[in-house]
């Protein structure tokens, strides 16, 4: 009985299409597949950013795979051919590994890259990113931001920079159609007549960096002799009510009475007849049903009642 062997895939490579971290891994079928003509060959692909402890593993019948990587680091990948037992009339067979790597040759020292990059998607409508210039770079250094997400034909450059002392320190993005719930890739590179500038790469999903507007129309309603209902409305904009969490801060007679997190636009408060003053503020955040993370809004304007019997009326500012 001769042992059945299969070769690894040929021409395994990582291709950078210029999407700032979204790379193509591609290969060709192994040599001498003629013996397995009636056979569906599969490929096991393992890949990771260099320095990562874990490999990502996929099995595919294709000759390519696409995924996102951190281009601040190198990438390594390996692939082998898999034959299920139906191909060999015996046991499953796998080839040796074919391996490849990819990295962008870094220019400049790390200190020259932008510092403290911060991106916020205001009210799920307007993306703004800001940064500080690299350490020790001269005023002739300018930074340029490029971005890409699936749906764009190619990476785009920022067209509305925020400037300080003639340097780009931020970007106001245009309307970004169909850009949430997918990886959003950014590269900030730079140029200087004095010295080369290191590029920086960032990846995030827009729904996870949303800072909503604060809630509006805060009201009080007396529910019973010892209960007051606090109500507010969701802020204007595209974020649906089901996507909000709220934090309320209530002060009774200058003492913090309650801080609470709620999912609805109401909160019922137990009070005493002695209450002379009641104030509350609310802020909002996108909840776990709509994102993995988020940023609290600013606090709403304060809504207060004072000097009248709370039981006598509904209070509306």
């Amino acid at each position: 009985d001769t042992e059945i062997k299969v070769n690894p895939p040929q021409d395994f490579e990582i291709v950078d299409p210029g999407y700032l971290g979204y790379l193509y891994l591609q290969w060709q079928p192994p040599l001498s597949l003629d013996h397995f003509k009636e056979c569906t060959v599969e490929y096991e692909l393992k890949y990771r950013n260099i320095g990562s402890e874990t490999w990502k593993t996929i099995i595919t019948k294709n000759l390519h795979y696409k995924d996102g990587f951190d281009l601040n680091k190198g990438i390594e990948a390996k692939i082998h051919t898999l034959l299920p037992w139906q191909c060999t009339n015996g046991s499953e067979v796998q080839s040796s590994w074919a391996e490849t790597t990819y990295w962008i040759s870094p220019q400049g020292i790390p200190e020259t890259k932008v510092q403290d990059m911060d991106c916020v998607y205001y009210n799920w409508q307007y993306l703004l990113c800001s940064w500080k210039p690299g350490i020790g770079v001269l005023l002739d250094t300018n930074y340029n931001l490029f971005y890409w997400y699936e749906g764009l034909d190619h990476a785009l450059q920022c067209v509305d920079y925020i400037k300080a002392d003639g340097q780009n320190i931020g970007c106001r993005f245009p309307y970004l159609e169909a850009s949430d719930y997918k990886d959003f890739y950014i590269c900030v590179n730079g140029s200087s007549e004095n010295k080369p500038i290191r590029s920086s790469y960032f990846t995030f999903q827009l729904q996870n960096i949303v800072k909503p507007l604060p809630p509006v129309y805060l009201t009080f309603t007396r529910e019973s002799s010892c209960e007051i209902k606090l109500k507010w409305s969701i802020p204007l904009g595209p974020i649906p009510a089901r996507c909000f969490d709220y934090e309320i801060e209530i002060r009774e007679d200058d003492t913090t009475l309650v801080t609470a997190t709620v999912e609805n636009e109401t909160y019922t408060l137990k009070t005493t007849n002695e209450t002379r003053q009641l104030c509350f503020v609310v802020r909002s955040k996108v909840n776990i049903y709509c994102s993995d993370d988020g940023i609290w809004s600013e606090w709403s304007d304060k809504q207060c009642w004072e000097g009248e019997d709370l039981s006598k009326k509904t209070l509306l500012r």
Epitope: T40, E42, E92
Partner: antibody, heavy 121, light 108 residues
């Protein structure tokens, strides 16, 4: 006749562990990749994990990676799913399924009757 | 991950009707698609594999077609036994293997 018989389901508290078994008969077990697929009450099908015929390749859905371990004992024609750190969202009927053709997963031509796992305090 | 989207979610039909269920993949999966039938309280049953191959023992009124990203399951003449939920599933690239959300075929 191909048969797959799951066992080991039951009620468990959040954070607890269970081990599911699937006894296979009627086919050459060691040759076929196998998978676990679950179905939460009133919901659709969700693939959980797969394993190659030899047991050398194991694959997981992100939702269970690091918590569940698939294994097989080809001498006993049995597939296993060790479930640790269970959560309420793991509540489902768990099916074992035989892969019709392929290395680690594929179309599933035979399914067990399912075993119910309930995670609740 | 490859997403699978089925339509419609629910389909009301009568015995004898020709029924078509559609499954769309978020990227090309060639012909690596299966269709299953599931009845309440029972395990799924394989109907079609490799997009168009009829599983042994499945009535010929079931057929599958399509490749790439668009697939259909057709029941040429709906029978009383066919009222069930149907799922598509891709096995082109994994993990994960992914299923459509299901289409319930109910009596009109």
């Amino acid at each position: 006749e191909v048969q797959l018989l799951e066992s080991g389901g039951g009620l468990v508290q959040p954070g607890g562990s269970l081990r599911l078994s699937c006894a296979a008969s009627g086919f050459t077990f060691r040759r076929y990749a196998m998978s676990w697929v679950r179905q939460a009450p009133g919901k659709g099908l969700e693939w959980v994990s797969g394993i190659s015929g030899s047991g050398g390749g194991t694959y997981y859905a992100d939702s269970v990676k690091g918590r569940f371990t698939i294994s097989r004992d080809n001498s006993k024609n049995t597939l296993y799913l060790q479930m640790n750190s269970l959560r309420a969202e793991d509540t489902a009927v768990y099916y074992c399924a035989k892969v019709r053709y392929g290395w680690g997963a594929g179309a599933f031509d035979y399914w067990g009757q399912g075993t119910l796992v309930t995670v609740s305090s | 991950d490859i997403q699978m989207t089925q339509s419609p979610s629910t389909l009301s039909a009568s015995v004898g009707d020709r029924v078509t269920i559609t499954c769309r993949a978020s990227q090309s999966i060639s012909s690596w698609l299966a269709w299953y039938q599931q009845k309440p309280g029972k395990a799924p049953k394989l109907l079609i594999y490799d997009a168009s191959s009829l599983e042994s023992g499945v009535p010929s009124r079931f057929s599958g077609s399509g490749s790439g990203t668009e697939f259909t399951l057709t029941i040429s003449s709906l029978q009383p036994d066919d009222f069930a939920t149907y799922y598509c599933q891709q096995y082109d690239t994994y993990p994960p293997i992914t299923f459509g959300q299901g289409t319930k075929v109910e009596i009109k």
